[in-house]
């Protein structure tokens, strides 16, 4: 039986070449977390396993820092950045929990003039 | 090449116990989780058992829990079984397999090692 | 339990033909979903997991789709290699369950 929930940051803005954390949260659970999976769209970003640690993707190396916590910190964004991110958790005996974060990425110019998502 | 290679199978009497190997290679084995699966005569799959990439997480059904041990030695790149209290039910091939390191599927499984119980 | 049913139990196609198998979940699943392959004497061999996504090396005349409770494979333009058992299996919830496979035969 499932009982957990994800609890997530929702929509979330930032600047071009700055950064931003992308956090989840698991709650409502006694399951023991086994491995969180980040992913944009269907691509890998970073795995957090409980006996192993992180393991960042080649590819994402140099913008991609673990944490905090089980978060993600994404840098030096670009517009390509915007988009669906995913929190995977895999528990036991739970299973699988997913979370979904949307992340846009704005020029600078149009974030200093407050254009922002607000998370509902 | 990725290789999983599973011996100590047999010919076994119910209440009896049994020690399943699976010595792998080429790849970093303390990197990945492993499991057991089987394959019962009638050819359905059922999950047996799972160990974390250190050891230091096991997880079972309720169908083996308290009968079946899982364990590894990440020395010798071995994944085991340690099987007791053995029912006619367990009778199957048993393989080892590897999990995809985002755990969502098996991505590499042995040749398999026959289990029969039976009196 | 999740139970995993799979249909149809056996499937005569010919060569060059496209065939479906479709994967029940009983209930949902997400996308956590993979199929495998087993040709008669041989090992399960990973095709498909979450839900469409090609395991490498695997051939692009298979496919897989679906998500929440209904999956389904498709291999098109069939191959005599094609011949096997196949099965799905979930990932959302322990224990993880397979559906009761699928022999495809050649007619």
């Known amino acids: 039986m499932m009982t957990g929930t994800i609890e997530t940051t929702g929509n979330i803005s930032a600047e071009k070449g700055g950064s931003i954390i992308l956090q989840c949260h698991l709650s409502s659970t006694t399951a023991q977390v086994t491995q969180v999976n980040w992913e944009q769209q269907d691509q890998l970003l970073a795995i957090c396993n409980a006996d192993l640690g992180w393991h960042i993707s080649p590819s994402f190396k140099d913008r991609v820092a673990p944490g905090p916590g089980l978060g993600l910190t994404l840098q030096s964004l670009t517009v390509n950045d915007t988009g669906e991110y995913f929190c995977i958790y895999h528990t036991y005996p739970d299973g699988t929990y997913t979370g979904r974060i949307f992340l846009e990425v704005l020029e600078s110019s149009v974030a200093e003039h407050g254009a922002r998502f607000q998370i509902p | 090449e990725v290789m999983m290679v599973e011996s100590g199978g047999g010919l076994v009497k119910p209440g009896g116990s049994l020690k399943l190997s699976c010595a792998a290679s080429?790849?970093?084995?303390?990197?990945?989780?492993m499991s057991w699966v089987r394959q019962t005569p009638e050819k359905r799959l059922e999950w047996v058992a799972t160990?974390?990439?250190?050891?230091?997480?096991?997880y079972y059904p309720d169908s083996v829990k308290g009968r079946f041990t899982i364990s590894r030695d990440n020395a010798k790149s071995t994944l085991y079984l340690q099987m007791s209290s053995l029912r006619s039910e367990d009778t199957a091939m048993y393989y080892c397999?590897?999990?995809?390191?985002?755990?969502?599927?098996?991505?590499?499984w042995g040749q398999g090692t026959s289990v029969t119980v039976s009196s | 339990d999740i139970q995993m049913n799979q249909s149809p139990s056996s499937l005569s196609a010919s060569l060059g033909d496209t065939i479906t198998i479709t994967c029940h979940a009983s209930?949902?699943?997400?996308?956590?979903l993979s199929w495998y392959q087993q040709k008669p004497g041989n090992i399960p061999k990973l095709l498909i997991y979450?839900?469409?996504t090609l395991h490498t090396g695997v051939p692009s005349r298979f496919s897989g789709s679906g998500s929440g409770s209904g999956f389904t494979l498709t291999i098109s333009s069939l191959q005599p290699e094609d011949i096997a058992t196949y099965y799905c299996?979930?990932?959302?919830?322990?224990?993880?369950?397979f559906g009761g496979g699928t022999k495809l035969e050649i007619k």
């Open positions: 397999a590897r999990w995809l390191l985002t755990y969502y599927a098996m991505d590499y």
């Open positions: 080429g790849f970093t084995f303390s990197s990945y989780t």
């Open positions: 160990i974390s990439g250190r050891g230091g997480n096991t």
């Open positions: 209930q949902n699943i997400n996308v956590w």
């Open positions: 979450k839900a469409s």
């Open positions: 299996q979930q990932g959302q919830s322990y224990p993880y369950t």
